[in-house]
């Protein structure tokens, strides 16, 4: 006996058309573009029925419902916003992403996405996946442009990217995007092997205020060139952190150099280092301390490093130099790990050119320089380390 | 983000019941095609699956295990629960919570190993 | 429940192709689904409906399905692909998972 004519779903239709369907006929159903197939919720390939000797077919008839690509993924430090309507979902539908203002922009595209035929969210450059909220670097409520010796206490605001390192001694360091910490590889090498030893507090201004935002070391990674106690050649290091920091007006990441970034690091430009380390007073600063200090000829500051105690070499091409010839301003033992920033007036954001490193004995001694780790020379392993981990 | 994040208890002796309760963020149990699975893997064994629930409430469970396992969802709360009664050594696995989507089970939860022994 | 049969395990030398199958009753009328998993971690979906990648999967995995047989391409393997796979395809509302294939990258 023939089967039920069978009727199409709506949207689809069904192939191939016969006036009747006997035993071991078959049909097959076809979606319109922007419906699929769907047995409940599950998508299929396709579907045949078979007709059987009892007049029945030996499967339901499917459904063509229409795409949906259901409510989309949530995007950290960002909202989703529904622009076809509220909450459709469905083919042809389009949502527009977006980061929290001021201090996270998109990466990866325009944040326009449109629910294709494929079921899933696909933005113009035809990506499945989430853009990125990235924080943005280097702002600070500052306007002009580890060791602070005769600087001035620090504002809510000023230094946001500054970290504070306590592990055994006080150091400090910078953050990089959300969860990256750029610091001396002295300050932290007695860690390397033991990161979560490292208390890391930032979004603070004074050093023992109980309210920091606290994070924690997930890996700590040392210069490969750099060798502990044989001088400071290479010392630098990067702290990963265990989960990102929220970003907002007293927690954001401080910018790598551009390769622009030279012209406002040239000799007698100004950079500032901040940080709580010992202070003309000779103690340990309680409030977070900046000072601004000209860059100093790179000859010149060898040359000051060449008498003994210092031995042949101690400055290296890694490194620069700031400060006063007169001396008393200077970074001295606890800002070691910080940051020397510039303003990078193209782009009005502040990048790191240094790392407080070392010097001489005496801080803010006349003729003696502080010696900061030139980072400009470090992008490819910073960037590499951060890609790879 | 999405996460999917297990929960129960970590032993469970011969015959009774094991709850375990599936914690999700980051997506909507209410809305959309999405669905949430349990796939259990005994050690050193394959993946099993066990079950699944949709927005719509639809639920699917292994023919070979329908008439111990229960699925059920709290949206207001954002979980999903599996009960399984009976429980034998044999059942000793670590039990995956995971989301459904365009067929794909596309993000999966840590796993909790689950043990059962007098 | 219908069966999916995968070789237990494969061998390849770093930058070879390593093909993985999956083979089942009519497989090439379902979709398939492949899984990564590597030791002590989840599994991780790297190819749906047959032969969609995944954001965030490399483009040297591929996929395919026709016939009898679904195929898991990896072209120039790397150390880092070494793992556990398993396919997976839905029959009747119900999920099937393959024995899984153990990759080993020499």
């Known amino acids: 006996q023939p089967c039920p004519y069978p009727m199409a779903p709506p949207n689809g239709h069904v192939s191939p058309v016969q006036a009747k369907y006997i035993l071991k006929d078959s049909f097959s159903i076809f979606c319109e573009t922007g419906y699929e197939l769907l047995q409940g919720h599950l998508p299929l390939k396709s579907f045949t029925a078979v007709c059987q000797k009892d007049g029945s077919w030996d499967r339901p008839m499917p459904a063509c419902s229409i795409v949906d690509c259901g409510p989309p993924d949530d995007l950290p430090s960002g909202r989703v916003e529904y622009i076809t309507g509220p909450g459709v979902t469905t083919y042809k539908a389009v949502i527009q992403y977006s980061c929290e203002e001021t201090f996270y922009t998109m990466k990866v595209n325009d944040g326009k996405y449109v629910c294709e035929a494929d079921g899933f969210w696909t933005s113009s450059k035809g990506e499945k996946s989430l853009p990125v909220c990235e924080p943005v670097c280097g702002l600070s409520a500052r306007t002009t442009g580890g060791r602070i010796y005769g600087g001035q206490k620090a504002k809510p605001g000023d230094f946001p990217w500054q970290v504070l390192i306590l592990g055994g001694t006080t150091a400090a360091g910078a953050l990089l995007y959300d969860n990256w910490v750029l610091t001396a590889a002295h300050a932290v090498y007695e860690q390397k092997h033991d990161a979560s030893a490292l208390d890391i507090r930032m979004g603070t201004l004074k050093r023992l205020s109980p309210h920091y935002t606290q994070a924690w070391s997930e890996a700590v990674f040392i210069h490969e060139g750099y060798t502990h106690d044989a001088g400071f050649d290479n010392d630098i290091a990067l702290i990963k952190l265990n989960n990102k920091v929220v970003i907002n007006s007293n927690i954001t990441p401080i910018c790598l150099p551009r390769k622009e970034a030279e012209s406002f690091m040239r000799t007698d430009d100004i950079g500032t280092a901040s940080g709580w380390g010992l202070t003309q007073r000779g103690f340990l600063a309680r409030n977070l301390m900046y000072v601004d200090i000209p860059i100093v000829d790179h000859q010149k500051c060898t040359a000051a490093y060449e008498k003994p105690p210092y031995p042949r070499g101690s400055v290296t091409a890694n490194m620069l130099c700031a400060g006063l010839e007169s001396g008393g301003k200077d970074s001295c033992r606890g800002d070691a790990g910080g940051a020397l920033v510039f303003l990078d007036s193209e782009t009005e954001r502040w990048f790191v050119g240094g790392i407080v490193s070392w010097g001489s004995m005496n801080c803010g001694e006349a003729g003696q320089y502080g010696v900061y780790t030139k980072v400009i020379n470090y992008i490819p392993w910073i960037e590499n380390i951060i890609s790879d981990f | 983000q999405v996460t999917l994040k297990e929960s129960g208890p970590v032993l469970v002796k011969p015959t009774e019941t094991l709850t375990l309760t599936c914690t999700v963020s980051?997506?909507?149990?209410?809305?959309?095609?999405?669905?949430v699975s349990w796939i259990r893997q005994p050690p050193g064994k394959a993946l099993e699956w066990l079950a699944h629930?949709?927005?719509?409430?639809?639920?699917s469970y292994r023919t070979s295990l329908k008439s111990r396992l229960t699925i059920s969802k709290d949206t207001s709360k954002n979980q999903v629960v599996l009960t399984m009664t009976n429980m034998d050594p044999v059942d000793t696995a670590t039990y995956y919570c995971?989301?459904?989507?365009?067929?794909?089970?596309?993000?999966w939860g840590q796993g909790t190993l689950v043990t059962v022994s007098s | 429940q219908p069966v999916l049969t995968q070789p237990p395990s494969l061998s390849v030398s770093p930058g070879q192709t390593a093909s993985i199958t999956c083979s089942g009753e009519?497989?090439?009328?379902?979709?398939a689904y492949w899984y990564q998993q590597k030791p002590g971690q989840s599994p991780v979906l790297v190819m749906y409906?047959?032969?969609q990648r995944p954001s965030g999967i490399p483009e040297r995995f591929s996929g395919s399905n026709s016939g009898n047989t679904a195929t898991l391409t990896i072209s120039g393997t790397q150390a880092m692909d070494e793992a556990d796979y398993y396919c997976?395809?839905?029959?009747?509302?119900?999920?099937?998972f393959g024995g899984g294939t153990k990759l080993t990258v020499l």
């Open positions: 995971a989301r459904i989507r365009a067929g794909g089970i596309d993000y």
């Open positions: 980051g997506f909507s149990l209410s809305r959309g095609k999405m669905g």
């Open positions: 629930i949709f927005s719509s409430d639809e639920k």
């Open positions: 009519k497989l090439g009328d379902k979709y």
């Open positions: 409906q047959d032969k």
């Open positions: 997976q395809a839905w029959d009747s509302s119900t999920a099937v």
